[in-house]
Interface confidence: low
């Protein structure tokens, strides 16, 4: 397993609708045709997998139907969007990139993006 550099923003604030987007960029040492991107969430020293997608270079990035993530790829950049976030989901979201094919296998793990989620205040009833 060979190491690879992965860059991602340090901090992102989710929108009032609970959507957070960030770019995950990897320094590809070779011409990979198959790439796997995994988003991990680290909170209270526990790491859980949020979502994962395997895609062919040049094709759309397709997350599974059960996933809260969507994304697009462009060259060595992956634009990730996580939906349905609530305040309790605030945490460090780590981008892990694997170059699956062809060999050799490369693995890169970013330093993480701290996503802050603030639940919107409920709107007061109004008489319009």
């Amino acid at each position: 397993c060979k190491a690879m550099h992965v860059a991602q923003p340090a901090v992102v604030l989710a929108s009032s609708r609970g959507i957070a987007s960030f770019v995950c960029e990897y320094a590809s040492p070779g011409k990979a045709t198959e790439v796997r991107v995994t988003v991990l969430r680290q909170a209270d020293s526990q790491v859980t997998e949020v979502c994962a997608a395997t895609y062919m270079m040049g094709n759309e990035l397709t997350f599974l139907d059960d996933s809260i993530c969507t994304g697009t790829s462009s060259g060595n950049q992956v634009n990730l969007t996580i939906q349905g976030l609530r305040a309790m989901d605030t945490g460090l979201y780590i981008c892990k990139v694997e170059l699956m094919y062809p060999p050799p296998y490369y693995l890169g793990i970013g330093n993480g993006t701290q996503i802050y989620v603030i639940d919107p205040e409920p709107c007061p009833d109004s008489d319009f």
């Epitope: 859980t48 997998e49 979502c51 759309e60 397709t62 599974l64 139907d65 059960d66 996933s67």
Partner: antibody
């Protein structure tokens, strides 16, 4: 009515290859990924991989990477799976099954299965 | 890879009894999906997205759970319910199935 009709049983020798088909009808073939799942006799279900008939992009279970190849023929709405370097433990029923999307349940439609027997 | 462990492997009950089938995931999954399979037949989607009954599935079936622990429950067993049930996750590749729970007549 959605239907997936698979090719007939195959008897192969160890080291050989097998290519099976899955003909889809009753829906737009390019709108849904096609997955392949196998089941050895008396055993559980094992996912092999899937293919997007539109882009022809594939995702494989690493266990089958390099041995299985998924392809499609859009003109005939048919998906194919080839498995190479067959071993006795590849003896199983191989199913094609249709992915879903945000509005349709995944794996709601299955082919009848293709029995592959690997024996010398 | 997310490993799904089903328990028990075999469940022997009589018609009219309540059945509880469990599926435990090695890491958190978004939803669990369940399939019913009878000998010599292809699997049938039975419950999807944890708790939604597939078309034609009787209301005596229900699904629940979250995170790593999920359950399929049959409130009152009928003869046609005796089969093997598999859980499945589609949260991350590779898609994986549990090893199955065989529900047999006592």
């Amino acid at each position: 009515e959605v239907q997936l009709v698979q090719s007939g049983a195959e008897l192969k020798k160890p080291g050989a290859s097998v290519k099976m088909s899955c003909k889809a009808s009753g829906y737009t073939f390019t709108d849904y990924n096609m997955d392949w799942v196998r089941q050895a006799h008396g055993k559980g279900l094992e996912w092999i991989g899937n293919i997007n008939p539109n882009s022809e992009s594939t995702s494989y279970n690493q266990k089958f990477k390099g041995r299985a190849t998924l392809t499609v023929d859009k003109s005939s709405s048919t998906a194919y799976m080839e498995l190479r370097s067959l071993r006795s433990d590849d003896t199983a029923v191989y199913y094609c099954t249709r992915d879903g999307n945000r509005y349709d349940a995944w794996f709601a439609y299955w082919g009848q299965g293709t029995l592959v027997t690997v024996s010398s | 890879e997310i490993v799904l462990t089903q328990s028990p492997a075999t469940l022997s009950l009589s018609p009219g009894e309540r059945a509880t089938l469990s599926c435990s995931a090695s890491s958190s999954v978004t939803y669990m999906h369940w399939f019913q399979q009878k000998p010599g037949k292809a699997p049938k989607l039975w419950i999807y997205s944890t708790s939604i009954l597939a078309s034609g599935v009787p209301a005596r079936f229900s699904g629940s759970g979250s995170g790593t622990d999920y359950t399929l429950t049959i409130s009152r067993l009928e003869a046609e319910d005796f089969a093997t049930y598999y859980c499945q996750q589609r949260t991350s590749y590779p898609l994986t199935f549990g090893q199955g729970t065989k529900l047999e007549i006592k």
